[in-house]
């Protein structure tokens, strides 16, 4: 007996071939001997089966001695043995219909779990193997679970169901809802405008929710809410914003915040959370602000940074086109009695300059100029 695997909701074509390459009488029945369809000359006739409105054939193949049974919009309960009667012969085909569904929404928050459930006909013993977009394989029986979804799990999951050495492939599109970056650092000189961007790693037609940016300044003992906002159909509207600092927010996606001035008291780290409508849990992105200030007071030239810097970062003071006068893995460096000229304060990571501030030191009879 030939075995054919089908997918729930799909179309299957069961073949039946006569030895004569011409249109002759045929009919298809189910295991209960109820007629599904057949022919009368060049016309298709249908029987009283449950498949009535979903069963079809291809007249174009009848002349070649092929009499297929097409079953549309397959259901699990269509699993059965189908019998084709032609030329006093009987051809039996066993159809097994499977369904594979994500038993939650296919749009999941980063860190959540994905469960895939296999629907199968009674008496079948299928095995399932799924391959994630990043090439990770998972195997299982009736259910497959993946915990702690990551951004790279977004995309098409390809699942193969094996039964009777036959296979059927399912493709399920999964969208992991997350920000493109888990965290980011912005390096700014004191007084510069700061732009924070929070691009999403997914696109959906309608996006509604609410969000908040909490900020922990390095100098402050506790964190505070800088801004709260609503998101409606990808349009952003500010609900509440602190007076200091007075943040501005873009009205469209990606989420965009502007801090008018980088000041030492703002240096620190923030956490932007976004709660999406009809989703449990929140999206998070960490953002860090590092602020640099170079100053000259009397005979002391000082360079300082505030904010979350890694211990391996190097802070240096150097006269333009000369070797660094001072270079330390600290958050403040200074030079006593600096020579006149353009001094550079550099924050660097393995030789790569992250932040630079210039200060002009004038001969001792005049006051310093900050460009």
């Amino acid at each position: 007996k030939k075995v054919v695997l089908g997918k729930k909701g799909d179309t299957v074509e069961l073949t039946c071939t006569a030895s004569q390459k011409k249109s002759i009488q045929f009919h298809w029945k189910n295991s209960n001997q109820i007629k599904i369809l057949g022919n009368q000359g060049s016309f298709l006739t249908k029987g009283p089966s449950k498949l009535n409105d979903r069963a079809d054939s291809r007249r174009s193949l009848w002349d070649q001695g092929n009499f297929p049974l097409i079953i549309k919009n397959l259901k699990i309960e269509d699993s059965d043995t189908y019998i084709c009667e032609v030329e006093d012969q009987k051809e039996e085909v066993q159809l097994l219909v499977f369904g594979l569904t994500a038993n939650s929404d296919t749009h999941l928050l980063q860190g959540q779990s994905l469960t895939l459930t296999l629907e199968s006909p009674p008496g079948s013993s299928p095995s399932v193997q799924c391959r994630s977009p990043r090439g990770k394989n998972i195997q299982g029986g009736k259910t497959l679970s993946v915990s702690q979804l990551e951004l790279q799990d977004s995309g098409t999951w390809t699942c193969t169901v094996l039964q009777n050495q036959k296979k059927v492939e399912f493709k399920i599109d999964i969208v992991v809802l997350a920000f493109q970056k888990a965290s980011s650092i912005v390096y700014k000189k004191e007084g510069e405008q700061v732009e924070f961007s929070f691009p999403l790693a997914f696109t959906v037609e309608k996006l509604t929710g609410s969000g908040e940016l909490w900020w922990q300044a390095e100098r402050a003992s506790s964190s505070k809410s800088w801004i709260t906002f609503d998101l409606k159909n990808k349009e952003v509207s500010v609900k509440r914003v602190t007076q200091d600092p007075k943040l501005q927010m873009g009205k469209k996606l990606p989420l965009h915040l502007t801090l008018p001035q980088a000041l030492p008291q703002y240096a620190g780290s923030g956490n932007l959370t976004l709660a999406l409508e009809a989703k449990t849990g929140k999206l998070h992105q960490e953002v860090n602000l590092v602020v640099m200030r170079a100053t000259q007071l009397q005979k002391n030239l000082t360079c300082e940074v505030w904010g979350p810097t890694s211990p391996k970062l190097m802070l240096s003071l150097k006269l333009e086109n000369k070797e660094a006068k001072v270079s330390k893995r600290e958050k403040a460096v200074w030079v006593l009695n600096p020579e006149a000229g353009m001094w550079q304060c550099l924050l660097s990571d393995s030789g790569q300059v992250l932040l630079e501030s210039n200060i002009k030191v004038l001969p001792t009879w005049s006051t310093p100029v900050q460009p």
Epitope: K7, D10, T11, V12, E13, S42, F43, L44, D56, S57, R58, R59, S60, D63, I70
Partner: antibody, heavy 121, light 107 residues
Framework: QVQLVQSGAEVKKPGASVKVSCKAS????????MHWVRQAPGQGLEWMGI????????SYAQKFQGRVTMTRDTSTSTVYMELSSLRSEDTAVYYC??????????????WGQGTLVTVSS | DIQMTQSPSSLSASVGDRVTITCRAS??????LAWYQQKPGKAPKLLIY???SLQSGVPSRFSGSGSGTDFTLTISSLQPEDFATYYC?????????FGQGTRLEIK
């Protein structure tokens, strides 16, 4: 949603062959047959043949028998139509079309965007 | 091969008009006929199948009738987007054949 994306325009010399591809997505590739229909500039539509992507069986219009070959690659969900011994009258837009079956009859439900094949010396 | 003949080959009409296009088969094709709409530079689109069944998503102002050898496509009230070329096609048996087309233009 069903999408049929065809390969780009081709310019061929008389006597040469052309192979046009049609990549299917948005449905189970092996569950529906694919037809090829062509349309000469400013002219009507002409059916060329059909392929069953599941088994690869084909049926061609008598007019193209011996010159046309339809094949498929199930791993990439792509069907191909190759036409050989090209002549100037083969200059046309070639379409692939996925069918729908209703009461035993095939109709052309979804069409590719078309591929212009120009045969010129 | 079954020959399909459409008339008229071109037709001028105004928005809101009722328009009828006819198609004749050289032999009986029962109701195995389809109507396709084609706009310049685009692929054809299935409007009607089985002579009178409206394809999903097609506006109800389009209707088809006929059986055997004579068929008609009717547009009850022309809309600006309906100006195109219309083809009938027999799907009785291979090779499937099309009418020469009816070009519907704005008057």
């Amino acid at each position: 949603q069903v999408q049929l994306v065809q390969s780009g325009a081709e310019v061929k010399k008389p006597g040469a062959s052309v192979k046009v591809s049609c990549k299917a997505s948005g449905y189970t590739f092996t569950s529906y047959y694919m037809h090829w229909v062509r349309q000469a500039p400013g002219q009507g539509l002409e059916w060329m043949g059909i392929i069953n992507p599941s088994g690869g069986s084909t049926s061609y219009a008598q007019k193209f028998q011996g010159r046309v070959t339809m094949t498929r690659d199930t791993s990439t969900s792509t069907v191909y139509m190759e036409l050989s011994s090209l002549r100037s009258e083969d200059t046309a837009v070639y379409y692939c079309a996925k069918d729908i079956v209703h009461d035993g009859t095939e109709y052309f439900q979804h069409w590719g965007q078309g591929t212009l094949v120009t045969v010129s010396s | 091969d079954i020959q399909m003949t459409q008339s008229p080959s071109s037709l001028s009409a105004s928005v809101g008009d009722r328009v009828t296009i006819t198609c004749r088969a050289s032999q009986s094709i029962s109701d195995w006929l389809a109507w396709y709409q084609q706009k310049p530079g685009k692929a054809p689109k299935l409007l009607i199948y089985a002579a009178s069944s409206l394809q999903s998503g097609v506006p109800s102002r389009f209707s088809g009738s006929g059986s055997g050898t004579d068929f008609t496509l009717t547009i009850s009230s022309l809309q600006p987007e309906d100006f195109a070329t219309y083809y009938c096609a027999q799907h009785n048996h291979y090779p499937y054949t099309f009418g020469q087309g009816t070009r519907l233009e704005i008057k």
